[in-house]
């Protein structure tokens, strides 16, 4: 019997300082570019090596960015979201949602001889 996949969702405030080459990540999503079904949110698709986000270490690929400097990212066109980041200034505060996959064991009793997979 297969285990059920659940997700542990946490939120975090991440303060980044724009580096010489910027913030150092890519995004997908927006009302005109839905990356996740029925969700027009903005997601991190790439963390650039040695960029500001990578050096900070907290932002991860797959994170959903909820707001930038207190401005909500809901219902934005993709390019408008990109422009918001580009114009966010030197000190950038991101409210992000991490979604950690949690593998639960099989439902029901596991006997002594069963593998612990």
């Amino acid at each position: 019997m297969n285990g059920r996949v659940d997700y542990l969702v946490t939120e975090e405030e991440i303060n980044l300082t724009r580096g010489p080459s910027g913030l150092g990540f890519n995004i997908v999503g927006g009302t005109d570019q839905q990356y996740v079904s029925n969700d027009s949110g903005i997601y991190v698709s790439r963390i650039k090596e040695n960029g500001a986000a990578a050096l900070d270490g907290r932002l991860q690929e797959g994170d959903k960015i909820l707001s930038v400097n207190g401005q909500d990212l809901k219902n934005l066109l993709h390019q408008d979201a990109v422009d918001l980041f580009r114009n966010a200034g030197y000190a950038v505060s991101l409210r992000v949602q991490h979604r950690l996959q949690v593998q639960n064991g099989p439902i029901g009793h596991r006997g002594e001889g069963d593998p612990s997979g």
Partner: nanobody
Framework: DVQLVESGGGLVQAGGSLRLSCTAS????????MAWFRQAPGKEREFVAA??????YYADSVKGRFTISRDNAKNTMYLQMNSLKPEDTAVYIC?????????????????????WGQGTQVTVSS
């Protein structure tokens, strides 16, 4: 991981045309930022053209002759090359990255891209 496969290269006379294709794996192709680079023997890899969510970019040497486009339904990017010159002879390589950079985009910078194809040879004879 994203796989990129180029096709459409060949031998063509100066003044002729070719259309290159780059087919990508992945269900989110429409979100990819994509580019064409080229490399001639003994030369550095050179930017040719790029296509993002918001627009297209071209090297000065190909502007007005080459057109980059994409068909998201077919997971394919194209490079239509017209008025070909002998100096266009090179291996043409497709590059991609998922999403749009939140920083200023430098289409000609190879570090903007994570995935690269093997290339397709284009030879223009005089």
């Amino acid at each position: 991981d994203v796989q990129l496969v180029e096709s459409g290269g060949g031998l063509v006379q100066a003044g002729g045309s070719l259309r290159l294709s780059c087919t990508a794996s992945g269900r989110t192709f429409s979100t990819y930022t994509m580019a064409w680079f080229r490399q001639a023997p003994g030369k550095e890899r050179e930017f040719v053209a790029a296509i993002t969510w918001s627009g297209t970019y071209y090297a000065d040497s190909v502007k007005g002759r080459f057109t980059i486009s994409r068909d998201n339904a077919k997971n394919t990017m194209y490079l239509q090359m017209n008025s070909l010159k002998p100096e266009d002879t090179a291996v043409y390589i497709c590059a991609a990255v998922i999403g749009s950079t939140v920083d200023s985009y430098s289409p000609s910078d190879p570090l903007e891209y994570d995935y690269w194809g093997q290339g397709t040879q284009v030879t223009v004879s005089s």
